[in-house]
Amino acid sequence: LRLLDHRALVCSQPGLNCTVKNSTCLDDSWIHPRNLTPSSPKDLQIQLHFAHTQQGDLFPVAHIEWTLQTDASILYLEGAELSVLQLNTNERLCVRFEFLSKLRHHHRRWRFTFSHFVVDPDQEYEVTVHHLPKPIPDGDPNHQSKNFLVPDCEHARMKVTTPCMSSGSLWDPNITVETLEAHQLRVSFTLWNESTHYQILLTSFPHMENHSCFEHMHHIPAPRPEEFHQRSNVTLTLRNLKGCCRHQVQIQPFFSSCLNDCLRHSATVSCPEMPDTPEPIPDYMPLW
């Protein structure tokens, strides 16, 4: 988790002088509770936006937006703490909006936005906006949280972001798999324009199970430049096991931008359909 580096972070708006500061996620009001605290944020919305860095790289960011409730507690609102928690790693990053002037009611509802948390493809986050000061230990909570799922690199807009392109998102191998005689699979895919090797992983499963009954890998050496964008054809021998009939083929490239952590592409071959065997008709009809 990190903040986009592309410009000075601002939270000021007409009628409010505000500055964005790094936060330890442990606001002083936790340690020194105040008697009067503001109410919680209203209508917290998280959306996927995209932003360029100063270097021109494009990153997915969490666009956080919320409004204030129209009650007198805004007189005690000193700022907000924005927290983003990556759920699979428990990594947390916070920033603090520090209000340098008092808020006053005006004809429109106060609205705040922040779009500088860089998020990763195919990750889930919990976004929390805490109004400051935080409540006393038994006080009503004055925060709002929402979960936010970032699409993976198959998503049209995500595909062209720097992290997705670095992991090989622009490569479309267009995998085809056909079953041959004598327990073999023919795998065909399009090579990318880089002289790097590929690894094909074949995992076979029984018809209705998810525990594999066979696994095989095949190495494809780095193609020569004249082979770039050409089709590569590989014949894989299956294990002759009755019922080991559902096959998943994964192709992993080793591009220089992602090395051994590039996006894999896969194709699946289902078990052959079993013809419905009709109920046998008895030779005679019983009378009882």
Partner: nanobody, 113 residues
Framework: EVQLVESGGGLVQAGGSLRLSCAAS????????TAWYRQAPGKQRDMVAT???????NYADTLKGRFTISRDNAKNIVYLQMNSLKPEDTAVYYC???????WGQGTQVTVSS
């Protein structure tokens, strides 16, 4: 998460032998394809040997007859026996379980002439 730890590398004279080990924790390897790769300084990581879940093996053409991949399912260890070593075998050797995309940290093998 599957962890792989390679060991057994070192400095050896040309013509000598080494046996590399790759200990896996976090999952059993008996029903998984496994592989050894190597990476010489300034070069790409290259496949050395693979073994599928049925125990069938495959080797890089230049290494056939000198290197042998095997595994001990009870100990959850994959081995690479390297004989008749040559200076061009000098590299960092990595163990790989493709299903989990798990890689070890590598073990350095240096063959002196």
């Amino acid at each position: 998460e599957v962890q792989l730890v390679e060991s057994g590398g070192g400095l050896v004279q040309a013509g000598g032998s080494l046996r590399l080990s790759c200990a896996a924790s976090g999952s059993t390897i008996s029903d998984r394809a496994t592989a050894w790769y190597r990476q010489a300084p300034g070069k790409q990581r290259d496949m050395v040997a693979t073994m599928n879940s049925a125990g069938n093996t495959n080797y890089a053409d230049t290494l056939k007859g000198r290197f042998t991949i095997s595994r001990d399912n009870a100990k959850n260890i994959v081995y690479l026996q390297m004989n008749s070593l040559k200076p061009e075998d000098t590299a960092v050797y990595y163990c790989n379980i493709p299903y989990f995309n798990s890689w070890g940290q590598g073990t350095q093998v240096t063959v002196s002439s």
